[in-house]
């Protein structure tokens, strides 16, 4: 997954006893929050693995790359990064692995340059629909976000609200149409069983979509048609059994796409014939020669590209009276 990177190494570390003396005041130009390391040359602040329970209030105004990883933030309230003067330069924000379970509406407001946001590896039981849009208007001001990294944000089963996790995430992605400029979206390792059908149509600028290591069984109701400039579609390590004609045609119609399909339990029966034909002709699938059948048992480990129509049969459906349980 992507994350902000720093290009210089001259970090200054502040002493813990300076912690809150000036936290309510505007930060001095060279000030570094307690428990953080700062490099003005690299415009980078790192507050990493420090068990912080809230976002430091005295972040330096120059910060462009902010790492707040490996902390214990729990809740990201509205305006968590709102400062006077604002953090106008902040472009890349990494909050991964900080035990966030709630991100509230407007958490990222007043960050006019925020292009990269990584919330991965947080058990987000409560992601507000307005976490990224900042308001509940039907059309919000466009978010500056270009990359949104949400890998492994699924909470444990017992901590989920009584609603679809997929639905909660999608609501946040679509609210106010704020993310129309999003180019990279990573949603890997989230136990997604399905992809809500409206999500992709409303993210027309997507270039990279990572849905790997989920539990997607089918793409039948998903349309990629609006993603005219999609460049990578990662579907590795899901539960896909077959891709049907409609999906194949849509993917083939995207001139810049590369599709990644490794490690899915492909079912090599009569329904697989169209996909096999397509695989033999297409150039869009990366490593297509590695795709193998998982079912039925007699076809296990057969290479899809080596199959022909005679290999792909379906057992006749028995009338109910002849079926055994």
């Amino acid at each position: 997954s992507s994350s902000p990177t720093s290009s210089a190494s001259s970090f200054s570390s502040s002493a813990p006893f300076l912690a809150s003396a000036v936290s309510a005041q505007p930060p001095l130009p060279d000030q570094c929050p307690a428990l953080c390391e700062c490099s003005e040359a690299a415009r980078t602040v790192k507050c990493v693995n420090r068990n912080l329970t809230e976002v430091p209030t005295d972040l330096p105004a120059y910060v462009r790359n902010l790492f707040l990883t490996g902390n214990q933030l729990a809740v990201l309230p509205a305006g968590a990064f709102a400062r006077r003067p604002p953090l106008a330069e902040l472009a890349a924000l990494n909050l991964s692995g900080s035990r966030l379970d709630e991100v509230r509406a407007g958490a990222f407001e007043h960050l006019p340059s925020l292009r990269q946001l990584d919330l991965s590896h947080n058990p987000l039981a409560d992601l507000s629909p307005f976490a990224f849009s900042g308001s509940n208007a039907s059309v919000s001001a466009p978010s500056p976000l270009v990359e949104l990294i949400l890998n492994h944000i699924v909470p444990p089963e017992d901590e989920r609200q009584n609603r679809s996790f997929e639905g909660m995430v999608v609501a946040a992605l679509l609210a106010g149409r704020a993310l129309q400029g999003l180019r990279r979206l990573e949603l890997a390792s989230n136990h997604f069983l399905y992809l809500p059908r409206d999500v992709l149509a409303q993210l027309p600028s997507l270039r990279h979509l990572d849905l790997s290591n989920n539990s997607l069984v089918s793409l039948t109701y998903v349309s990629f048609r609006n993603l005219t400039h999609l460049e990578s579609l990662h579907l590795e390590d899901n539960a896909l059994k077959v891709l049907h004609n409609g999906t194949l045609a849509e993917l083939q119609g995207l001139p810049h796409i590369r599709v990644f399909l490794d490690n899915n339990p492909w079912v090599c029966d009569c329904h697989m014939a169209d996909m096999v034909t397509w695989l033999k002709e297409t150039e869009v699938v990366q490593g297509k020669d590695r795709l193998t059948c998982a079912y039925p048992e007699k076809m296990r480990n057969r290479v899809l590209l080596e199959l022909n129509s005679a290999d792909l049969d379906c057992d006749p459906i028995l009338p109910p009276s002849l079926q055994t349980s």
């Epitope: 990359e147 270039r207 990279h208 005219t228 400039h229 460049e231 119609g253 001139p255 810049h256 590369r258």
Partner: antibody, heavy 115, light 107 residues
Framework: QVQLVQSGAEVKKPGASVKVSCKAS????????MNWVRQAPGQGLEWMGR????????NYNGKFKGRVTMTADKSITTAYMELSRLRSDDTAVYYC????????WGQGTLVTVSS | DIQMTQSPSSLSASVGDRVTITCRAS??????LNWYQQKPGKAPKLLIY???RLHSGVPSRFSGSGSGTDYTFTISSLQPEDIATYFC?????????FGGGTKVEIK
């Protein structure tokens, strides 16, 4: 903003090869596709091919098949275009262009083929 | 290969004029049509992609329209800095191909 910086001008003899480099910065938001386009003096633009930098997959214009090789080194965010068996009509400015729709272009590299 | 026919090859207009350039593809290109601006001695710059989408930072006086095989590029009010050559390009079917260019001058 994505920036592409190309290697300097080259003078080559017919039959020789040339290798042009293109270094990308502002990389976080750049595309995986790097295209190569050339422009002969006073002429239009001609697409030569493209490389998908993540896995090295290439598409070449049939006109250059067998003479052009595109490679990429992810570790240094640099793409390369090598054209072999040069002829005088290969004299042109060679551009790298990042993106499916060629969103960002390098400054160009003039390759002169002359005996 | 898909042929892209651009017209006119050159035009002269006054500052403030509306300028229109057309591009015709030899077959349907499903809106995968881009427009570039090139000034002398410089690299081309993307202005419009996918027929009508404005590339970031491009002034709103530039626009595009069309479908199927016929596409149009418009400068709503020509400015002195718009003096350049404009190219169309299709990225629907490999190999990508360009139009021959339209040189825009000030009267």
């Amino acid at each position: 903003q994505v920036q592409l910086v190309q290697s300097g001008a080259e003078v080559k003899k017919p039959g020789a090869s040339v290798k042009v480099s293109c270094k990308a910065s502002g990389y976080a938001f750049s595309s995986s596709w790097m295209n190569w386009v050339r422009q002969a003096p006073g002429q239009g633009l001609e697409w030569m091919g493209r490389i998908y930098r993540e896995d090295g997959h290439t598409n070449y214009n049939g006109k250059f098949k067998g003479r052009v090789t595109m490679t990429a080194d992810k570790s240094i965010t640099t793409a390369y275009m090598e054209l072999s068996r040069l002829r005088s009509d290969d004299t042109a400015v060679y551009y790298c262009a990042n993106g499916g729709a060629m969103d960002y272009w390098g400054q160009g590299t003039l390759v002169t083929v002359s005996s | 290969d898909i042929q892209m026919t651009q017209s006119p090859s050159s035009l002269s207009a006054s500052v403030g004029d509306r300028v229109t350039i057309t591009c015709r593809a030899s077959q349907d290109i499903s809106n995968y049509l881009n427009w570039y601006q090139q000034k002398p001695g410089k690299a081309p710059k993307l202005l419009i992609y996918y027929t009508s989408r404005l590339h970031s930072g491009v002034p709103s006086r530039f626009s595009g329209s069309g479908s199927g095989t016929d596409y149009t590029f418009t400068i709503s009010s020509l400015q002195p800095e718009d003096i350049a050559t404009y190219f169309c390009q299709q990225d629907n079917t490999l190999p990508w191909t360009f139009g021959g260019g339209t040189k825009v001058e000030i009267k």
